[in-house]
């Protein structure tokens, strides 16, 4: 499809002149930020951003790539170098330490400097690094964590936990030696390391004693509580604050978010990760957009401002499965949440960042016609005279041989949410990729997000913009609309 | 390898504080640009940038990813949407029209709006769009084109040509009907469409009559001239200017670039594309860095300034071959040329952009240890119990089956310049990829390069910064150091 209006040079010249006009008008917001929001698209490399843009555009009945995402409207962009201290290609634990604490760490460790060693409990003490969320709380702001994964997962844990092993979700996931040496599971750290006002996501089973039935799946033993210490961490958390409320479904979340007596809110909507958006039951589970809105309602009440972490955490999972349909529908939902947050906040007082922790070996190639489905086949056939998809992976479970040859694929197969795009190398799980990811920024001090930076720079921009440690002497005018 | 200094949080905190300090000090250069330089890494998507950074760092005996490329030092970054009017994933012709002329076109067409149709000569007339280089020449600036491909190749041709078929290098590549309808081959357009002061790259055979022996390969008939019209285009070009000089080897280039009587310089160093850097004979052929330096010497003499296009054109070719070694060594050489240009120009009066026309389905994954060779194997084995490389392709000639199975690979194989990384789908040629590419900017008006933009915006930024058509009423103070 060639859109007639795009055949005219005036279309492009006018559009560019408008973009130039906007660029010339762009003025840095030089005040401090009252509020900080970081949107983290887990595994959302640039190829995922572009493919999600096309999908979102096509969902809106456009051709695709011309239609801006919410994040595309952010005025400032930088590239972030994601390597961990010990690996060229990182994981979500080491990267969370970087963008949330401002210090790079080692693969699979969270909230610890690189002096800590994976799985060695005795290297924890003394190597803790403090998250920007923690510093925001100390400065009197309200703070929240929202994710589509378990709230104890690597990315959100970077905001509150310190652990040499990202897999220590509950004490049942830890070796006895680590427990004896005094290391704490992530769920325990969630409720005890710091005061978090809003906690929304999955991860019920790590909060309750082993065998405790799940409220949503009472007859499914695999969803029972897992804790060996017999504790009810939700109960312990509720006891800390008079205005604390725990919810486990969408209806309760909506009620709680509108209740002025609720000061602290924990919503855990699945035993483990939340369901993919395409599998979500909207009568039971909230969307990422709804969780973001609920969090913003509560956090916005604090006159001193807030810090909010929002993760589209299952973009990554879709890619690991070699299922681009899942990754991209998650990415579109993530962008919807960004859009909603933009409507509920002001760029005058809120610094909003959108970024990824790392990328994936996911590519969008061949030469598909404009307007063709993002999940479609490439024009023409491969050398083996079989069809192939425009979306492909470098490695992963999409690698299959059928009778010693690459399998053919039809349009109708390639569109299925279950379809695994093919890969060059067979792995149980498709891997992350090591290329730089984008950081999109809007609001006070967003102009500092520029050029090519270490991923750890992201945390420092947030800390500086809100005059948090170690930048309390930030020398910035107070946020718009404040009087202190 | 875990670098000891990186184990200390102070290392990262200090580094980030310095980066913040630099970001806060960053002041837009609000004057007009006297000079414009666009560095075009053909096929240099973000994954190529990161992998090249690691390779360049390792060449410098560092671990790799921490070591900035020359382009990493540019203060402003944007993302560029590369789709063509008719394709989600574009080619180098349609994209050249976008970033050099400011208007998006159709796949395989150059210097024409999307009203033109591929290969249909009669859709050319009236649909021509004018490059920024052409506008710079009209404004009295000197202009130059430097590439490692043929100078008649798609990317450089975007600066001077208008053609419905990028493959019409000489009249021998055109159907008789197109010649009869008055369409001109690209080599003819190179010498006749406009006055170009410096032309450096490959492409000798398209300039001379069929059967004319090549000076470097006189006994290789496949390198003979190709022109059916019997013309000697070099002779015709030399006749246009008293100070014109033609050179075909490195020694002559060095002499000519230092000769003040030379006002126009054409250097064609190979019959077709120039050799890959790893195959270059430095006694015969100049490097991209040397060609860039020679061009800058000549062009800098003009008190009104210059426009220079420099292409690392064979990054793309390495990827098409599924040979990452070639693509990445070309990218490192490209970065060396950027570095040299930075030493020879001032950011006070020169707007320098670095970008790509499109990406490739090239990924850098697995979880390789820090400091491991960029060409190395992934840690561990694949599901088929064979080794695999960190670098892989989505599609391309790297796909091979050996006895109905994926072949194994050793470290020594994977490090060979000839090695083709494996791919998910077998194609003669690995394809481009459709994700956004980075635009790096430094100099006057570089701050306008921000956010996510259409690729066509790039040309408009250059035109505006230098107050060229259609932005002659740019309302900018004159460039630094000028008196008019």
């Amino acid at each position: 499809i060639i859109p007639v209006e795009e055949e005219n040079p005036d279309f492009w010249n006018r559009q560019a002149a408008e973009a130039l006009g906007a660029a010339k008008k762009l003025q840095p917001i030089q005040t401090a930020a009252k509020n900080l929001i970081i949107f983290l698209g887990d595994g959302m490399g640039v190829s995922t951003v572009t493919a999600a843009r096309i999908l979102k555009g096509q969902k809106e009945e456009k051709l695709g790539p011309e239609t801006p995402l919410a994040m595309d409207h952010f005025p400032y962009v930088a590239l972030s170098k994601t390597y961990s201290v010990d690996k060229h290609v990182p994981d979500s634990a080491a990267t969370a330490t970087a963008y949330l604490c401002g210090v790079k760490g080692n693969f699979q460790t969270i909230g610890l400097s690189a002096a800590a060693r994976y799985n060695q409990c005795n290297t924890t003490r003394g190597n803790e690094v403090v998250s920007v969320m923690n510093r925001a709380k100390k400065a009197g702001k309200s703070v929240g964590v929202v994710t589509t994964t378990r709230v104890q997962h690597a990315s959100p844990a970077g905001a509150y936990a310190h652990t040499v092993n990202r897999n220590w979700y509950s004490d049942a996931n830890m070796p006895g030696s680590a427990r004896r040496e005094g290391c704490k599971d992530i769920a325990t750290q969630l409720i005890s390391n710091m005061d978090i006002d809003v906690i929304l996501g999955g991860g019920r089973k790590y909060m309750f004693r082993m065998g405790a039935p799940d409220p949503e799946y009472p007859h499914d033993y695999s969803q029972d509580g897992t804790r060996m210490d017999g504790k009810n961490l939700v109960q312990e958390w509720l006891a800390k604050h008079q205005g604390a409320r725990y919810v486990w479904n969408r209806t309760e979340l909506m009620q709680a978010s509108l209740d002025p007596s609720v000061t602290h809110l924990m919503g855990l909507f699945e035993p483990g990760d939340m369901k993919y958006e395409i599998h979500r039951d909207p009568t039971l589970d909230p969307s990422l957009m709804e969780m973001t809105e609920a969090a913003l309602r509560l956090l916005s009440r604090n006159p001193r401002g807030f810090f909010l972490f929002v993760e589209g955490g299952r973009i990554d999972h879709g890619h690991h499965e070699s299922r681009a349909y899942r990754a991209l529908t998650e990415a579109v939902m993530f962008d919807d949440a960004i859009e909603r947050a933009g409507q509920l906040t002001s760029e005058e007082d809120t610094l909003t960042l959108v970024t990824a922790d790392h990328s994936h070996v996911f590519s969008f190639g061949a030469y598909p016609l404009r307007g063709s489905s993002i999940f479609g086949l490439a024009p023409g056939k491969a050398q083996d005279r079989k069809a192939y998809t425009a979306l492909l992976y470098g490695n992963g479970p999409g690698y299959v041989l059928k009778d010693g040859a690459r399998p053919d694929v039809t349009e109708s197969e390639s569109g299925s949410p279950e379809y695994r795009q093919q890969a060059a190398v067979p792995l149980d799980e498709e891997t992350h990729a090591g290329e730089d990811v984008a950081v999109f920024a809007r609001g006070p001090q967003a102009h500092l997000v520029h050029g090519v930076q270490e991923q750890s720079f992201v945390a420092h921009v947030m800390a500086f913009a809100a005059c948090l440690e170690p930048y309390t002497a930030c020398d910035l005018a107070p946020p718009a609309g404040t009087t202190d | 390898i875990i670098p000891v200094e990186e184990e200390n949080p102070d290392f990262w905190n200090r580094q980030a504080a310095e980066a913040l300090g630099a970001a806060k000090k960053l002041q837009p250069i609000q004057t007009a640009a006297k000079n414009l330089i666009i560095f075009l890494g053909d096929g240099m998507g973000v994954s190529t940038v990161t992998a090249a950074r690691i390779l360049k760092g390792q060449k410098e005996e560092k671990l790799g990813p921490e070591t900035p490329l020359a382009m990493d030092h540019f203060p402003y970054v944007a993302l560029s949407k590369t789709y063509s009017v008719d394709k989600h994933v574009p080619d180098s012709a349609a994209t050249a029209t976008a970033y050099l002329c400011g208007v998006k076109g159709n796949f395989q067409t150059i210097g024409l709006s999307a009203a033109a149709r591929y290969n249909q000569c009669n859709t050319t007339r009236g649909n021509e769009v004018v490059s920024v280089m052409n506008r710079a020449k009209k404004a009295g600036k000197s202009v130059g084109v430097v590439t490692t491909t043929r100078v008649q190749h798609a990317s450089p041709a975007g600066a001077y040509a208008h053609t419905v078929n990028r493959n019409w290098y000489s009249d021998a590549n055109m159907p008789g009907s197109a010649r009869r309808e008055g369409c001109k081959d690209i080599a003819t357009q190179l010498i006749s469409n406009m006055d170009i002061d410096v032309i450096l790259g490959g492409g000798r055979k398209y300039m001379f009559r069929m059967g004319a022996p090549d000076p470097e390969y006189p006994h290789d008939y496949s390198q003979d001239g190709t022109r059916m019209d019997g013309k000697n285009l070099v002779q015709e070009w030399l006749a246009k200017h008293q100070g014109a000089r033609y050179v075909w080897n490195r020694t002559e280039l060095m002499q000519a670039s230092l000769d003040p009587s030379v006002t126009h310089l054409m250097g064609l160093f190979e019959p077709g594309d120039m050799k890959y850097e790893i195959h270059r004979d430095p006694t015969l052929d100049p490097s991209l860095m040397e060609m860039t330096e020679a061009a800058l010497r000549l062009l800098s003499r003009n008190p009104r300034g210059f426009f220079l296009f420099v292409e690392g054109g064979r990054i793309d070719h390495g990827h098409h071959e599924s040979r990452a070694y070639r693509a990445l060594t070309e990218a490192v050489m490209f970065d060396d040329a950027i570095e040299r240009a930075g030493q020879l120009t001032s950011e006070e009066d020169t707007l320098t952009l670095v970008t790509a026309d499109h990406s490739h389905v090239f990924s850098f994954g697995a979880y390789p240890l820090r400091g491991s060779s960029i060409f190395g194997l992934a840690p561990g084995k694949a599901q088929d119990r064979k080794a695999y490389t960190a670098l892989l392709y989505g599609n391309g000639p790297g796909y091979v089956l050996k006895d109905g199975a994926r072949p194994d690979v050793t470290e020594s194989e994977s490090g060979s310049p000839e090695y083709r990384q494996q791919a998910a789908v077998p194609l003669d040629e690995e394809t481009h990829a459709g994700e956004d590419v980075a635009v790096f900017a430094r100099g006057p008006q570089a701050h306008l390069v921000h956010g996510v933009q259409e690729q066509s915006f790039v040309a408009h930024v250059m035109a505006f910064a230098a107050c060229l058509e259609p932005y002659t009423a740019c309302d900018l103070a004159p460039p630094a150091g000028t008196t008019d």
Epitope: E60, E61, T329, S372, F375, G376, E411, G415 | -
Partner: nanobody, 121 residues
């Protein structure tokens, strides 16, 4: 998941009419573009018509002017009104759902089981 159930197929004389229905079991039916495909014996499945959530519509050239697609979001149902039927319209008709009209017309995510339409001459 989206479950699609077609109905309304049957035997009809050439020149006659049929109305196919497709009921979707899913909350965000209105987010999806809906389409109809058909597969004649021994042939590939081919696109017939699609309708986006915004009401934008596309038809295959072979059915333009004869078939009309419509949707009722309140009932989570999409319809295909088939007039001036020809023997070559004989096929199994499948309902499909996808994220946008371009996706549904090429690579639908969800398919119904199909309903047989036979046009006798």
């Amino acid at each position: 998941q989206v479950h699609l159930v077609e109905s309304g197929g049957g035997l009809v004389q050439a020149g006659g009419s049929l109305r196919l229905s497709c009921a979707a079991s899913r909350r965000s039916f209105s987010e999806y573009a809906m389409g109809w495909f058909r597969q004649a014996p021994g042939k590939e499945r081919e696109f017939v018509a699609a309708i986006g959530w915004s009401g934008v519509i596309e038809y295959a050239d072979s059915v333009k002017g004869r078939f009309t697609i419509s949707r009722d979001n309140a009932k989570d149902t999409v319809y295909l009104q088939m007039n001036s039927l020809k023997p070559e319209d004989t096929a199994v008709y499948y309902c499909a759902a996808g994220l946008g009209i371009r996706v549904v017309s090429q690579t639908p995510a969800y398919w119904g089981q199909g309903t047989q339409v036979t046009v006798s001459s």
